[in-house]
């Protein structure tokens, strides 16, 4: 008995073929011995079947001796044993219909879990293999469940069905709701402005939603909220903004926020979060400011660090075009009486510059001028 | 696993440079700086300096000021440690390490033999 | 410059015995930003390049077995094999990387009595 394997809402064709290569009286029927379809004459007949206005054939290939079965909108229940009878002959084919779908909204956020579930046939035992957009392979039974979905998990996942060594394909594409960024840092001088932008890794027609920012500065003892928003099909409107400091938020996305000045006060991590209209959970985005400043108090020339640092990281003092007068893993570093000149401080992380300053050191009788 | 693989041994005359070659090869070049240090025979560890390969900045210890000179070629992932002015007080094994502020892979070393 | 100073120069044990290699620092190696002292232990055999036993002073690179460990804070750091094996001969150096230049002790020869 030949398998055919079949997908929920495809189309599926069975082939019947005689050995005369010529029109010739021909029945499809059902393990019940209900007739599906068959032909008399050049003309289609269709039995009292459930199949009847899904059942159809293909009358051009008549002639050759090809009387294929096609089934259209394939249902579960549809599989079945389908017989041909021509010529005195029983052609009998096993049609196994499966159908895969995702137990929830194909689009998820970033962290939830994924269950696929597969419709098959009573008497089946078919087994599943999935591959991720990012390559990662899962197997499993009826159900299969991927937690703590990431990022790189957004796209087509292509799974597999095995069946009587037979196997079918399915694709479903599954959108992950996230940030494009789990954690960012922004690295600035005292004074600067400063921009936090937070980009979006989905794109949808309508998006709604609401979101703040929470921040934790590393010289206060609490969090506080910085700002409040709400979004209207991907509009951007301000509910409600803290007063030191005066943040600004942009009227469209990608969700931009700017902070007049770095100042050591501000320094610390926030943590952006954003509840979209018809979903459960949130999506965050960590993001980090160290701040630096470079001052000469009399004889002490100091370079400072605010903010959430990597203890890999080298803070340095040095006269431009020289070697490093002072090199530490500090947050904190001088030189007592600088000779005069234009003086870097650098903050580094294996040898790449994350942030710059710089203070001239004028000779003893001046004062020092920042540029 | 990222892997540094060292130029072969060099015998230089004084006076002369040498250009020692360190290649990465199976991980990410540019992440960490590379720092050299060298042994001279029957001697103890001495770090001459670093260089960033994704920057290209670099530092050097006080003594070899002026001597030496760290660059590096990104489309091979290799740096070069360059000492000129040879004395032969440099014969030495000189060896380039992943700086990951610990030195937690080391190429397998270069011995430079400096004599007349 | 922080320099670095072993003690002994070398040591004899027993296998299966206990050894303690000393090392001090002329600065503190201790962050105060940071609270991590930045100080490594490295293993030597003749003709190889070293090899990272301990970061943090105390922290065992993977792969190292346990019977290497590290302690102290500051200027005062102990490395200690718990049971010295025949594959353990070797120098063993002490590393500062708090600032630069980093600067190794001058080494700590251990061999079996």
């Known amino acids: 008995k030949k398998v055919v394997l079949g997908k929920k809402g495809d189309t599926v064709e069975l082939t019947c073929t005689a050995s005369q290569k010529k029109s010739i009286q021909f029945h499809w029927k059902n393990s019940n011995q209900i007739k599906i379809l068959g032909n008399q004459g050049s003309f289609l007949t269709k039995g009292p079947s459930k199949l009847n206005d899904r059942a159809d054939s293909r009358r051009s290939l008549w002639d050759q001796g090809n009387f294929p079965l096609i089934i259209k909108n394939l249902k579960i229940e549809d599989s079945d044993t389908y017989i041909c009878e021509v010529e005195d002959q029983k052609e009998e084919v096993q049609l196994l219909v499966f159908g895969l779908t995702a137990n929830s909204d194909t689009h998820l956020l970033q962290g939830q879990s994924l269950t696929l579930t597969l419709e098959s046939p009573p008497g089946s035992s078919p087994s599943v293999q999935c591959r991720s957009p990012r390559g990662k392979n899962i197997q499993g039974g009826k159900t299969l469940s991927v937690s703590q979905l990431e990022l790189q998990d957004s796209g087509t996942w292509t799974c597999t069905v095995l069946q009587n060594q037979k196997k079918v394909e399915f694709k479903i594409d599954i959108v992950v709701l996230a940030f494009q960024k789990a954690s960012s840092i922004v690295y600035k001088k005292e004074g600067e402005q400063v921009e936090f932008s937070f980009p979006l890794a989905f794109t949808v027609e309508k998006l709604t939603g609401s979101g703040e920012l929470w921040w934790q500065a590393e010289r206060a003892s609490s969090s506080k909220s910085w700002i409040t928003f709400d979004l209207k099909n991907k509009e951007v409107s301000v509910k409600r903004v803290t007063q030191d400091p005066k943040l600004q938020m942009g009227k469209k996305l990608p969700l931009h926020l700017t902070l007049p000045q770095a100042l050591p006060q501000y320094a610390g991590s926030g943590n952006l979060t954003l509840a979209l209209e018809a979903k459960t959970g949130k999506l965050h985005q960590e993001v980090n400011l160290v701040v630096m400043r470079a001052t000469q108090l009399q004889k002490n020339l100091t370079c400072e660090v605010w903010g959430p640092t990597s203890p890999k990281l080298m803070l340095s003092l040095k006269l431009e075009n020289k070697e490093a007068k002072v090199s530490k893993r500090e947050k904190a570093v001088w030189v007592l009486n600088p000779e005069a000149g234009m003086w870097q401080c650098l903050l580094s992380d294996s040898g790449q510059v994350l942030l710059e300053s710089n203070i001239k050191v004028l000779p003893t009788w001046s004062t020092p001028v920042q540029p | 696993q990222v892997q540094l693989v060292q130029s072969g041994a060099e015998v230089k005359k004084p006076g002369a440079s040498v250009k020692v070659s360190c290649k990465a090869s199976?991980?990410?070049?540019?992440?960490?700086?590379i720092s050299w240090v060298r042994q001279a025979p029957g001697q103890g560890l001495e770090w001459m300096g670093w260089m960033s390969p994704n920057s290209g900045n670099t530092g050097y210890a006080q003594k070899f000021q002026g001597r030496v000179t760290m660059t590096r070629d990104t489309s091979t992932s290799t740096v070069y440690m360059e000492l000129s002015s040879l004395r032969s007080e440099d014969t030495a094994v000189y060896y380039c390490?992943?700086?990951?502020?610990?030195?937690?892979?080391w190429g397998q070393g270069t011995m430079v033999t400096v004599s007349s | 410059d922080i320099v670095m100073t072993q003690s002994p120069d070398s040591l004899a044990v027993s296998l299966g015995e206990r050894a303690t290699i000393n090392c001090k620092s002329s600065q503190s190696v201790l962050s105060s930003s940071y609270n991590k002292n930045y100080l490594a232990w490295y293993q030597q055999k003749p003709g190889q390049p070293p090899k990272l036993l301990i970061y943090?002073?105390?922290s065992r690179q993977s792969g190292v077995p346990d019977r290497f460990s590290g302690s102290g804070s500051g200027t005062d750091f102990t490395l200690t094999i718990s049971s010295l094996q025949a594959e353990d001969v070797a120098v063993y150096y002490c590393?500062?990387?708090?600032?630069?230049?980093?600067?190794f002790g001058q080494g700590t020869k251990v061999e079996i009595k």
């Open positions: 390490a992943r700086d990951s502020g610990a030195f937690d892979i």
């Open positions: 943090w002073a105390s």
């Open positions: 199976g991980g990410t070049f540019s992440s960490y700086a």
């Open positions: 590393q500062q990387y708090y600032s630069t230049p980093l600067t």
